[in-house]
């Protein structure tokens, strides 16, 4: 049976004063000669020769300085041999522990840690966790690190706290304001021996970025604007409306959206935002009509692309800015409205028979023009004549078979209204369906024919006139007149609604 004893040795110092550091003895030595042998790391395995044994007495001595961080303990395998080299005992495993000294400072896993936290975050919100290790003995004061913030920039008031044991950095309060400071730099010290005065220390930097939240309400540079706009014109840059927002530039928290509160019911205006400058461009996208409206008041509001942060939801009140718009009159003169009309000519109509009227409207008065003269423009087969004063259209002659064949039963010509004062000419399109050539039936003109107009009203008449409403173009403007005006003028029985 083995009798054994082993003391611990201390790293980094001369342990020879403690020798023998261990002693082994077998009770087989009572009746025979025993030789003691040892093996293992520090003996016959690197680092060699740290331990030596007196083969006769079993005393084990330590010969050199040891490092716990390299070898925290030594396992010495001991044998008791007889004179023939045979084992007298089951080999013994002897453990020699190496006692720790505080010879290693804490080491941060990074020289500079990076973290981020939203402004206005609640107090005690986790920002980041610092990581540091100490090579000294685990679960020992020599490796127990205490963390401490030793410097904060800007240093106005402390904004962060650190858990001395875990290295967790948290917010001290809820006053972080990116608009005041967008970045903080902390210096943190980690000291072993749980922060004791006899401990070793290391330092690291922490860069904390303060993330923007939408806690600033956008507002327009001016509370009111005054503009003038000519009627009948489009404008892609009528007014620049600058928005001020203190949140992070170019972020959705900063980008503004200007919207109409009232006044734009006719959808004449649009506001396009420049996302680089936060300037809204007021555009005219639908022409205004001075005759219908000489001025209007627009009311506009502003919000951000992003939702407002909960911290300012209750503070947000919609503040409107006013835009006073004056519409300037433009002398417009006469135009054909509608720009195209369709008529029917039947086979029994002859020379000078009335086909219909095509009258220019004075846009400045809304009444038939009194200042124009009418002439035919394009007049295929020289079919029509026009009264230069009244705009009355008549057949020059009864339609011949040759004319009918040449036109294929369809006539399309133009009428011109010429205003010599304004030096302005407008064009209207005349469409004629030539019906039943060679047949004397009065097609589609029987008395009491029921025709439902676009207004839904029914008329019982032997003489009906319907204008088709299409698009008319003059030299400067495009107008879109609404269909559905119903029966406006009751003309002679050779006028037909529709193409």
């Amino acid at each position: 049976e083995w009798i054994k004893f082993a003391a611990a040795c201390r790293e980094g110092e001369d342990n020879s004063k403690r020798n023998p550091i261990a002693k082994i003895h077998s009770d087989c030595a009572a009746n025979q000669q025993v030789t003691y042998r040892i093996s293992g790391v520090g003996i016959d395995q690197p680092p060699y020769g740290i331990f030596v044994i007196n083969q006769k007495t079993g005393e084990i001595n330590i010969t050199s300085i040891v490092d716990r961080e390299v070898t925290p303990f030594f396992i010495i395998y001991c044998r008791a041999l007889n004179s023939m080299g045979q084992d007298l005992e089951r080999p013994l495993e002897l453990r020699v522990r190496v006692l720790d000294i505080n010879d290693n400072p804490p080491v941060f896993s990074m020289a500079t840690f990076a973290g981020q936290i939203e402004e206005n975050s609640n107090a005690n919100t986790l920002v980041m966790i610092l990581n540091a290790t100490d090579a000294d003995e685990p679960n020992n004061l020599n490796s127990k690190i205490a963390f401490k913030i030793i410097r904060q920039e800007p240093s106005d008031s402390p904004m962060f706290i650190i858990n001395r044991n875990t290295g967790e950095i948290r917010t001290m309060n809820n006053f972080l304001d990116r608009e005041q400071y967008g970045q903080y730099a902390l210096a943190v010290r980690g000291s072993d021996r749980d922060g004791g005065a006899d401990g070793m220390s290391a330092e690291c930097e922490c860069n904390i970025k303060i993330l923007d939240v939408n806690d600033n309400i956008p507002y327009m540079e001016q509370s009111s604007y005054t503009i003038e706009i000519q009627e009948n014109t489009l404008n892609s840059n009528l007014l620049e409306i600058r928005v001020i927002d203190l949140d992070e530039e170019f972020s959705a928290n900063w980008m503004a959206v200007i919207f109409f509160i009232s006044g734009n019911e006719g959808n004449w205006f649009e506001i396009e935002m420049n996302e680089r400058t936060n300037v809204g461009i007021l555009k005219v996208v639908k022409p205004l009509d001075y005759e219908a409206m000489q001025s209007l008041q627009l009311s506009i509001g502003v919000r951000n692309k992003a939702e407002f942060h909960h911290s300012i939801m209750s503070q947000y009140k919609l503040k409107a800015s006013a835009i006073s718009v004056t519409v300037l009159n433009v002398i417009e003169g006469p135009v054909f409205r509608p720009g195209s009309k369709t008529y029917v000519v039947t086979g029994n109509m002859g020379s000078n028979d009335k086909v219909g009227d095509f009258v220019a409207t004075d846009l400045d008065t809304g009444r038939p023009s009194t200042t124009v003269r009418y002439v035919m423009g394009n007049n295929p087969a020289d079919l029509l004549a026009v009264d230069s004063r009244t705009g009355k259209l008549t057949l020059k002659n009864k339609v011949t078979k040759e004319q009918y064949n040449m036109l294929g039963g369809k006539y399309q010509g133009t009428i011109l209204s010429i205003d010599d004062n304004l030096q302005r000419t407008c064009t209207g399109t005349i469409n004629i369906n030539i019906q039943s050539f060679g047949n004397d039936d009065r097609t589609n003109t029987e008395p009491n024919t029921k025709i439902t107009t676009n207004t839904g009203r029914q008329e019982s008449t032997s003489s009906t006139n319907y204008d088709t409403s299409t698009t008319s173009t003059d030299s400067s403007q495009v107008y879109s007149s609404e269909p559905g005006n119903g029966a406006k003028d009751l003309l002679s029985d050779n006028v037909h609604f529709g193409p």
Epitope: G40, I75, Y77, Q86, D87, R90, P91, E93
Partner: antibody, heavy 117, light 110 residues
């Protein structure tokens, strides 16, 4: 590299005898401590015996007096002589070497001993 | 009866950490070092941990051993499907004058 090749497993009647062999390569059996470990079908490992030297061997209580461990340095072989075999000795027997760390670190492939009438 | 006590089974999902315990007495674990073996189905056991916490070369550092008083434990972190096996603890017992094994723990990777 270290290798242990076993032989001698067989079907034997209760009360009978059997000798298992284990040939080592890659090391000398005289310089190592050699063990036998067995595993009954569907059961765990059970230590049988270890030889430390010609004068020092240990045996498990269940085989004491019936089994003998020995080694032959010239053949680099370890033997397990089994006698008075019982049904409960039925198992796969593993030969194993015990390195300097007093740890069974190398194992043979195992050989089946079946004791049945 | 068994001198070292192990749970008969343990399980975990891939990536998880599992621990297998081994309980003994002052005459075995209390006074000797503990070894751990892994036995894959149909193969011989393989040394996993010796001297309580030492890993032989070739054994991944996912396997670690520890000993405290009369108990020892094997921890496997980052569990992998190939870890599915039987695990045995072993030590020397001074009063029995022999080596003793635990009953084994069957580890299942779910």
């Amino acid at each position: 590299q270290v290798q242990l090749v076993q032989s001698g497993g067989d079907l034997v009647q209760p009360g009978g005898s059997l000798r298992l062999s284990c040939v080592a390569s890659g090391f000398n059996v005289n310089d190592n401590y050699m063990s036998w470990v067995r595993q009954a079908p569907g059961k765990g490992l059970e230590w049988v015996s270890t030889i430390y030297s010609e004068t020092l061997s240990y045996y498990g209580d269940s085989v004491k007096g019936r089994f003998t461990v020995s080694r032959d340095g010239s053949k680099n072989t370890v033997f397990l002589q089994m006698s008075s075999l019982k049904g409960e000795d039925t198992a796969v027997y593993y030969c194993a070497s015990e390195g300097g760390g007093l740890t069974i670190d190398y194992w043979g492939q195992g050989t089946l001993v079946a004791v049945s009438s | 009866e068994l001198v070292l006590t192990q749970p008969p089974s343990a399980s975990g999902t891939p990536g998880q950490r599992v621990t297998i315990s081994c309980s003994g007495s002052s005459s075995n674990i209390g006074s000797n070092t503990v070894n751990w073996y892994q036995q894959l189905p149909g193969t011989a056991p393989k040394l996993l941990i010796y001297s309580n916490n030492q890993r032989p070369s070739g054994v991944p550092d996912r396997f670690s051993g520890s000993k405290s008083g009369t108990s020892a434990s094997l921890a496997i972190s980052g569990l992998q499907s190939e870890d599915e096996a039987d695990y045995y603890c072993a030590t020397w017992d001074d009063s029995l004058n022999g080596r003793v094994f635990g009953g084994g723990t069957q580890l299942t990777v779910l």
